[in-house]
């Protein structure tokens, strides 16, 4: 089948990094500068992505693969293949339309991206707050009171996983 196909379509013999040049009697020609073909049998080469402005080149374009971009310091990637760069904020902040804003009391963000999330509500699991939350960190819930009573066994059996409560204390 492959032999038949190649007899019918000489372009199928053109490897990645080349294109089947109709202007030159379907000869396999190398991709021109700043273009690539990642698969064989291509009739055109794709234009290389250019990482400009807030984008930074993570991997140079080659004849067989596109360039890959990431973001300059102070920004982070969003979208498939880093299609967008979004401004970083500090931990304890979130990005709004008006720029970086501190997390409201009762919420935290431990990353430079994303939104402020409510502190865990320990009492929903029958626990109490062991370490207070901050703008940058969630609270730490202590063990359940049953774990602290005299004669409590040292090793507790695993409990079924539950989502943490997410309303502020």
């Amino acid at each position: 089948f492959e032999r038949t196909r190649s007899l019918q379509d000489p372009c199928s013999n053109c490897p990645a990094g080349t294109f089947c040049d109709n202007n030159r009697n379907q000869i396999c020609s190398p991709c021109p500068p700043n273009s690539f073909s990642s698969a064989g049998g291509q009739r055109t080469c794709d234009i290389c992505r250019q990482c400009k402005g807030v984008f930074r080149t993570r991997k140079e374009c080659s004849s067989t693969s596109n360039a890959e971009c990431d973001c300059t310091p102070g920004f982070h990637c969003l979208g498939a293949g880093c299609s967008m760069c979004e401004q970083d904020c500090k931990q304890g902040q979130e990005l709004t339309k008006k720029g970086c804003k501190d997390c409201c009391f009762g919420t935290f963000n431990d990353q430079k991206r994303g939104i402020c999330r409510p502190w865990t509500n320990c009492s929903l699991d029958g626990k109490s707050v062991l370490v207070n939350g901050t703008k940058e960190r969630d609270v730490v819930c202590g063990p359940s009171p049953a774990d602290l009573s005299p004669g409590a066994s040292s090793v507790t059996p695993p409990a079924p996983a539950r989502e943490p409560g997410h309303s502020p204390q």
Partner: nanobody, 117 residues
Framework: QVQLVESGGGLVQAGGSLRLSCAAS????????VAWYRQAPGKQRELVAV????????KYADSVKGRFTISRDITKNAVDLQMVSLKPEDTAVYTC??????????WGQGTQVTVSS
């Protein structure tokens, strides 16, 4: 759940020091915090010290402040408790706990610390 194993307990004279270690079978720092508790016979288990997974916050019981230091050892996947100026009232079984806000707490089996006068 992570398996926790404490070591470093023993018999020591008042004024002496011990270093307890809590080693974990899995990543101990994926938990919200790791704490040391102690329990004397017939008494409730009490918090000694706690350290958050990132190491940015530590908290101590008033009775051990200035004498005990909790720290992370990332290379050993462990949390240590350095105890100095030990007193007879520090005698107890010391147990480490990996604390997770959702779900249950993982406990070690404990290590005995006895301080003689």
């Amino acid at each position: 759940q992570v398996q926790l194993v404490e070591s470093g307990g023993g018999l020591v004279q008042a004024g002496g020091s011990l270093r307890l270690s809590c080693a974990a079978s899995g990543s101990i720092f994926s938990y919200n915090a790791v704490a040391w508790y102690r329990q004397a016979p017939g008494k409730q288990r009490e918090l000694v010290a706690v350290i958050t997974s990132g190491g940015e916050t530590t908290k101590y019981a008033d009775s051990v402040k200035g004498r005990f230091t909790i720290s992370r050892d990332i290379t050993k996947n462990a949390v240590d408790l350095q105890m100095v100026s030990l007193k007879p009232e520090d005698t107890a079984v010391y147990t480490c706990a990996a604390l997770r806000n959702s779900g249950s707490t993982s406990w070690g089996q404990g290590t005995q610390v006895t301080v003689s006068s």
